[in-house]
Amino acid sequence: FKVATPYSLYVCPEGQNVTLTCRLLGPVDKGHDVTFYKTWYRSSRGEVQTCSERRPIRNLTFQDLHLHHGGHQAANTSHDLAQRHGLESASDHHGNFSITMRNLTLLDSGLYCCLVVEIRHHHSEHRVHGAMELQVQTGKDAPSNCVVYPSSSQDSENITAA
């Protein structure tokens, strides 16, 4: 399977909410011995290998924000901890998964990574990730709502096996 990032850049005004999205593509094994671990984290922009460094989002680590379920099942993060930080990650039946960030500030700007790990019991795991940039705008040049920029076809199938 692969991870696609429909949008490579999100430009949002301060105070707005945004939902960053990744999509699972390709055949997904729905067997009983397969589960999917999905999560989000921030990463440095200057890396040779994108998303190799895992930094917290609003002081929450990728472990705090993870979803763990089978196949194309729907799931949400536990509300209490994430929502106190203005965050919610979610996954639907169609392979889409997302993180919603509320009340954006300049400090939320940066590179965000989604990670999917396929875990097969007694077998090796398969990891893929996608990356996107969030730019929170202030002042006269800020849009009134979030503006999204589609990934190039090359970027949108942003598969990196770890």
């Epitope: 921030r42 400090l107 730019q135 929170v136 040049d141």
Partner: antibody
């Protein structure tokens, strides 16, 4: 090592514009936001705004409204700050300063340019 | 804008003695558990030098006699034993909200 080298001192008349440059070296230029801070003679520090060199998007202190423009040239790893409709109160040392982390827009600075003195006088 | 108020505005300290500077923000500078408050020292003719970031983190290369504390709206910079090289103007800065704002500065001199 990280270096931010600014252009030389300028003397301008009221109503004119000034464009100050800041050339970065010693790190990946597009990975860190660049901010501008000014300091009037004998006064404190005033944050003017920032530019994300990766995307070219700026953000400004509303105090400067339509007078300030920040741009960048990735081919030369240089950022620019242009201030228009100059008045005597704009006489100050103008500093570029690099954001601390390469993963957010946090406005705190371990690296500063040497400063550019802009004098506005008729 | 968040207003930063420093006290005192000037300070005269005997070498080897401690010094303390306070900074109060007009509203909280907390960002999901981190206090976005910095301290800088500016020496004459030089750009500011970062001493403390995120309220209590001492910047690399800064002597360990400098420390920062506080949360919410009230913050303190302490120098355990002042040395001659510590003279200059100290500024606090908040980076929680745009525009980032600085205190008016505290001038430290040696007795």
């Amino acid at each position: 090592q990280v270096q931010l080298v600014q252009s030389g001192a300028e003397v301008k008349k009221p109503g004119a514009s000034v464009k100050v440059s800041c050339k970065a070296s010693g790190y990946t230029f597009t990975s860190y936001w660049m901010h501008w801070v000014r300091q009037a003679p004998g006064q404190g520090l005033e944050w003017m705004g920032y530019i994300n060199p990766s995307t070219g998007y700026p953000g400004y202190n509303q105090k400067f409204k339509d007078r300030v423009t920040m741009t960048r040239d990735t081919s030369t790893s240089t950022v620019y700050m242009e201030l228009s409709s100059l008045r005597s109160e704009d006489t100050a040392v103008y500093y570029c300063a690099r954001s601390y982390y390469d993963y957010d827009g946090g406005a705190w600075f371990a690296y500063w340019g040497q400063g550019t003195t802009v004098t506005v006088s008729s | 804008d968040i207003v930063m108020t420093q006290t005192p505005l000037s300070l005269s300290v005997t070498p080897g003695q401690p010094a303390s500077i306070s900074c109060r923000a007009s509203e909280s500078v907390e960002y999901y558990g981190t206090s976005l408050m910095q301290w800088y020292l500016q020496k004459p003719g030089q750009p500011p030098q970062l001493l403390i970031y995120a309220a209590s983190n001492v910047e690399s290369g800064v002597p360990d006699r400098f420390s920062g504390s506080g949360s919410g709206t009230d913050f303190t910079l302490k120098i355990s034993r002042v040395e001659a090289e510590d003279v200059g103007v100290y500024y606090c800065q908040q980076s929680r909200k745009v525009p980032s704002t600085f205190g008016q500065g505290t001038k430290l001199e040696i007795k």
